[in-house]
């Protein structure tokens, strides 16, 4: 999906009002400085591409974050503010339902969510601290 035509300001507002709090609650006191940032993004569409990938794609050591509250709110925001996004996600959602496993917060998941917080920071402050 090409995130170029999303309403970035509306997505930013959704992050600041709710998604950010859910990410922090998931981290349960784990500080951003406890992990190194290894994933970055260069502009807002690129940031959303990386955010989608880290949020919804299973990785080694962190099977699925997609059923977490922050992920469901992220999905809703993208569906509302990115034209045509929800249509591209139907097949992916069906595949995800088949993979669903017991929810376990591993250190790898905490690291992955810390990377997500970094990507969201970059998305929301695209003109600051350019890499």
């Amino acid at each position: 999906y090409d995130f170029t035509n999303c309403d970035f300001e509306k997505i930013k507002a959704a992050y600041l009002s709710t998604i950010s709090k859910d990410l922090i609650t998931y981290m349960s006191g784990t500080k951003s400085t406890e992990f190194n940032n290894t994933v970055s993004c260069s502009n807002r569409p690129h940031c959303l591409t990386e955010i989608q990938s880290l949020t919804f794609n299973p990785t080694a050591g962190c099977a699925s974050l997609a059923k977490e509250m922050f992920a469901m709110k992220t999905k809703a925001a993208l569906a509302i503010w990115c034209p045509g996004y929800s249509e591209t996600q139907i097949n992916a959602t069906q595949a995800m339902k088949k993979r669903r496993k017991r929810k376990v917060t591993t250190n790898k998941c905490l690291e992955q969510v810390s990377q997500l917080q970094g990507l969201w920071r970059r998305f929301n402050r695209p003109l600051l601290k350019q890499q």
């Epitope: 992050y15 600041l16 950010s20 709090k21 990410l23 922090i24 609650t25 981290m27 349960s28 006191g29 784990t30 500080k31 951003s32 400085t33 190194n36 940032n37 290894t38 810390s114 917080q117 970094g118 969201w120 920071r121 929301n124 601290k129 890499q131």
Partner: antibody, heavy 123, light 112 residues
Framework: QVQLQESGPGLVKPSGTLSLTCAVS?????????WNWVRQPPGKGLQWIGE???????NYNPSLKSRVTISVDMSKNQFSLKLSSVTAADTAVYFC????????????????WGQGILVTVSS | DIVMTQSPLSLPVTPGEPASISCRSS???????????LDWYLQKPGQSPQLLIY???DRASGVPDRFSGSGSGTDFTLKISRVEAEDVGIYYC?????????FGQGTKLEIK
């Protein structure tokens, strides 16, 4: 409005245990904050003692770690400091402070402080 | 532990004039996220410290815009563009990159 209020004895005997409590109002102790203790000897600078999260996870200053215990009481919305084997060098104003995260999970800035309580170690 | 060193330790300033305080850390406070984990606090006489600046340059809520923070890595500066009488007190820098959090010795700002 968030408020923090330290309480406890103002005088502790050498080799005894200093016990202080910080009552939190306007915020829940079980929110996503770290709750801190900082002290300031008379006429000197600030020293971080340690912190606790509502889960019970703690971080302590290594220089005090063997003598310090910080605990949380969610039912009373407060957290406490115990410092054992005190000496005159532990005489200080003790502050409790809140470390609330920003929107990106950054911690390490104390946005609310108690007014402080002077604890004197003397026989 | 990270050692924080401030200068000057005493700073007499005329009201309306600018003021500048330096803070150096024994190791870099720049995280891989490109943010510096350094705070500035002001402790007014007889009061608790109050947060002025966090993450090196972000002003805390309610802090006048005459206060600004800058710097990166190991060298940081707090600037007051026009000092007012209410700015008197002791200014502390604090590193928040890792525990134990550590403070500078403090800089006492007084009015000439």
């Amino acid at each position: 409005q968030v408020q923090l209020q330290e309480s406890g004895p103002g005088l502790v005997k050498p080799s005894g245990t200093l016990s202080l409590t910080c009552a939190v109002s306007g915020d829940s102790i079980s929110s996503d904050n770290w709750w801190n203790w900082v002290r300031q000897p008379p006429g000197k600078g600030l020293q971080w003692i340690g912190e606790i999260f509502h889960s019970g996870r703690t971080n302590y200053n290594p220089s005090l770690k063997s003598r310090v215990t910080i605990s949380v009481d969610m039912s009373k919305n407060q957290f406490s400091l115990k410092l054992s084997s005190v000496t005159a060098a532990d005489t200080a104003v003790y502050f409790c402070a809140r470390d609330a995260p920003n929107d990106y999970g950054d911690y390490g800035f104390f946005d609310y402080w108690g007014q402080g309580i002077l604890v004197t170690v003397s026989s | 532990d990270i050692v924080m060193t401030q200068s000057p330790l005493s700073l007499p300033v005329t009201p309306g004039e600018p003021a500048s305080i330096s803070c150096r850390s024994s190791q870099s406070l720049l995280h891989s996220n490109e943010y510096n984990y350094l705070d500035w606090y002001l402790q007014k006489p007889g009061q608790s410290p109050q947060l002025l600046i966090y993450l090196g340059s972000d002003r805390a809520s309610g802090v006048p815009d005459r206060f600004s923070g800058s710097g990166s890595g190991t060298d940081f500066t707090l600037k007051i563009s026009r000092v007012e009488a209410e700015d008197v007190g002791i200014y502390y820098c604090m590193q928040a990159l890792q525990t134990p959090y550590t403070f500078g010795q403090g800089t006492k700002l007084e009015i000439k």
